[in-house]
């Protein structure tokens, strides 16, 4: 670390005095201090001498000696006071620029440490400081206004009490700049616009910033529009607004509109699209298939997207049958607006019951007319099975009826013993019926099929099982003959048990 001679922290001299400051280090050393006249600098290897034969109040300040080659960057300092009875202040700068919330140092250096007790900071022409101005004083550095605000951008003077009267410094102008976080904030309203030819339209482009220095313009398809600008200041922000009013829109007004604002930090732009149409429109669509299949007991949400201008005058979900005349609950219908001209309507069917299969229609109306979108909802059912013993053309026949959706497949099993359900170990024979007769196949209903198994003689210690399955599940019915008679016995002689 360099050493300064004289080895005191501060030195007080009178004007005209000779001052010699010597700095010695291990290597070459350098002096740094306030810019002032009459100093002579002499360097000799590891020492440097700063001297003047005629000290003035302008030499007041802190002189620091550094050793550039020192990796630790050590330095030494001495503060020099040149106490001039006529000039209590040495002002190092007459303009100070800071950003809001920074500390602002007003560099009026006191030339006589004795005067410290009577110093104060005032605004020019003797005006007091603004309320809430928080400041401190250092005789070596001057006055510091802490966390300066934009409103404190003023001209200040430093005041010292000398012989009962206040002596002012020359003025220091403080400029507190707003912290501009970036380019101005923009809004372009509306985000999207549709009008029928001949209607009126308004597009508003507005920009705001903490600083007044910014520009804003509106352009249509890359052409800058000449629009009068309205300016305002509120919520501590400057606002500039451009309003484009079109009394009767035509197709040439359609296209892309961009709102562009710029300042020193850069440029922001936002765009919207203006569509001019010949007449009202109403379009319904769905991302879902209009033919839906859901397993009974499960839930389904039907969604319709609506694009419309002008806005909807009415809309509703309607159940068109075929099972009942009850309509969907309003609370199960939900509407969400994606934007001004696009909406999504959802019908929630949380636990589908057999009577809720059928057609669901979404209807909407605007000045362009009515539109409808219809969903067809078919429910899937696991098969339900029953078996009876009957005679067909004199032959004993087991008749299996299976109903479900999708259409069930039928398999017959014959197994040993009496059982509710044949397992693999008991199975004696298996017959697949690839083409069971379809008894009924109406839209939205279960498909009922019938399969016949001709049995010449019913074996009494055996079980005949009809098993039906589809994509939802399977069902079966076990037929157990309980009679000692021959195959010609009427059906009520036999017991069929589930």
């Amino acid at each position: 670390i360099p050493v300064i001679e004289p080895s005191v922290p501060e030195l007080v001299v009178k004007p005209g005095a000779t001052v010699t400051l010597r700095c010695v280090g291990n290597g070459s050393v350098e002096w740094d201090g306030p810019p002032s006249p009459h100093w002579t600098l002499y360097s000799d290897g590891s020492s440097s001498i700063l001297s003047t034969n005629n000290a003035t109040f302008q030499n007041t300040g802190t002189y620091r000696c550094t050793e550039p080659g020192d990796p630790l960057g050590g330095s030494a300092a001495i503060h020099l006071y040149v106490k001039d009875p006529a000039r209590p202040w040495n002002v190092l700068a007459q303009e100070v620029v800071v950003f809001e919330d920074q500390d602002a140092l007003l560099p009026c250096l006191l030339t006589d440490p004795v005067l410290e007790a009577g110093v104060s900071l005032v605004r020019v022409r003797g005006r007091p400081l603004m309320r809430h101005t928080n400041y401190s004083f250092s005789p070596w550095h001057g006055f510091t206004i802490h966390r300066a605000k934009f409103i404190q951008s003023q001209d200040y003077q430093c005041s010292a009490l000398m012989g009962g009267r206040k002596v002012m410094s020359i003025s220091i102008r403080l400029k507190v700049q707003k912290v501009i976080p970036g380019p101005p904030a923009l809004t372009l309203v509306p985000a999207e616009l549709v009008r029928i030819r001949g209607e009126a339209a308004q597009i508003v482009c507005s920009a705001s910033s903490v600083d007044v220095n910014f520009d804003v313009f509106l352009q249509h398809n890359n052409t800058k529009l000449a629009i009068p600008q309205q300016s305002d200041f509120h919520n501590n922000r400057y606002q500039k607004v451009l309003t484009l009013n079109l009394d009767q829109v035509d197709f040439q007004h359609a296209g892309n509109y961009s709102c562009v604002a710029s300042n020193v930090q850069g440029k922001h732009s936002t765009s919207m699209f203006f569509r001019v149409v010949e007449s009202a429109y109403l379009n319904l669509s769905s991302e879902q298939n209009l033919i839906q299949e859901v397993t009974v007991g499960e839930g389904l949400n039907l969604k319709v997207m609506v694009e419309a201008y002008p806005g909807l005058q009415g809309f509703n979900w309607t159940y068109l049958g075929p099972f009942s005349d009850h309509q969907p609950e309003p609370k199960l219908a939900n509407a969400t607006t994606k934007d001004t001209y696009r909406h999504t309507f959802t019908l929630s069917l949380p636990r589908l019951k057999p009577s809720e299969a059928g057609r669901y229609s979404f209807l909407a109306r605007n000045p362009g007319g009515w539109r409808a979108l219809t969903f067809e909802l078919t429910l899937r059912y696991p098969p339900e099975v029953s078996v009876i013993w009957t005679f067909i053309n004199g032959s004993g026949t087991l008749l299996c009826a299976a109903s479900g959706y999708p259409q069930p497949n039928v398999t017959w099993l014959q197994c040993s013993g009496h059982t509710d359900r044949c397992d693999e170990a008991q199975v004696l024979q298996v017959w697949d019926d690839p083409y069971p007769e379809v008894l009924s196949q109406e839209p939205f209903h279960k498909v009922t099929v019938q399969s016949l198994l001709t049995v010449e003689t019913l074996e009494h210690n055996q079980t005949y099982e009809c098993r039906a399955h589809n994509s939802v599940g399977s069902g079966s019915w076990a037929f157990i003959p309980i009679s000692a008679g021959a195959h010609t016995h009427p059906p009520d002689e036999f017991l069929f048990t589930p």
Epitope: G297, H326, S355, V472, G473, G475
Partner: antibody
Framework: QVQLQQWGAGLLKPSETLSLTCAVY????????WSWIRQPPGKGLEWIGE???????NYNPSLKSRVTISGDTSKNQFSLKLSSVTAADTAVYYC?????????WGQGTMVTVSS | EIVLTQSPGTLSLSPGERATLSCRAS???????LAWYQQKPGQAPRLLIY???SRATGIPDRFSGSGSGTDFTLTISRLEPEDFAVYYC?????????FGQGTKLEIK
């Protein structure tokens, strides 16, 4: 076509656990919701709870702390367990299928709780 | 929970007469998910009407249901001897599913 057949212990002591099973015949447990309902002697019907094929359950809040309903799709069966029974749980217990309301019912099992 | 109140508690009529049974809900029944059941001594209940007005499979057309919201009615247009039983209404629109206390239809 579809029939529900139920079984289980008919006589219990207080604090024991009631256990009933319901089998689905001629159809499948793989869709619909399946419920348990009870009816105290000479009184009205009370819904106990339900289960679907994926095992999702829903219980009557008045019994929720004591009820467990479980299902076995491979056997086409579902079961009811009611713990810590008292005399107030004496009732005929029914299993039922919910399609449009409770369209198919079991034959009922009389359960008596007595010390 | 939704409380269902049936009236009258007992209805005494003769075969051939018209029976009107009422069921009132403490709050609106979702999507008219209201059912009517018939129960005879020693038997399980039998579904008559679902969705407030739809007849279940195999139910004679002398049975009809009507109503929405909180007020529902079961009508038997011409009583047959086998119709004398206890009738329950039930809502299955919101959990817990609840039944009315029942209306006993007896022979006068």
């Amino acid at each position: 076509q579809v029939q529900l057949q139920q079984w289980g212990a008919g006589l219990l002591k207080p604090s024991e656990t009631l256990s009933l099973t319901c089998a689905v015949y001629g159809g499948s447990f793989s869709a619909y919701y399946w419920s348990w309902i009870r009816q105290p002697p000479g009184k009205g019907l009370e819904w106990i709870g339900e289960i679907n094929h994926s095992g999702s359950t829903n219980y009557n809040p008045s019994l929720k702390s004591r009820v467990t309903i479980s299902g076995d799709t491979s056997k086409n069966q579902f079961s009811l367990k009611l713990s810590s029974v008292t005399a107030a749980d004496t009732a005929v217990y029914y299993c039922a299928r919910e399609a449009d309301a409770f369209d198919i019912w079991g034959q009922g099992t009389m359960v008596t709780v007595s010390s | 929970e939704i409380v269902l109140t049936q009236s009258p508690g007992t209805l005494s009529l003769s075969p051939g007469e018209r029976a009107t049974l009422s069921c009132r809900a403490s709050q609106s029944v979702s999507s008219s998910y209201l059912a009517w059941y018939q129960q005879k001594p020693g038997q399980a209940p039998r579904l008559l009407i679902y969705g407030a007005s739809s007849r279940a499979t195999g139910i004679p057309d002398r049975f009809s249901g009507s109503g929405s919201g909180t007020d529902f009615t079961l009508t038997i247009s011409r009583l047959e001897p086998e119709d004398f039983a206890v009738y329950y209404c039930q809502q299955y629109g919101s959990s817990p599913y609840t039944f009315g206390q029942g209306t006993k239809l007896e022979i006068k």
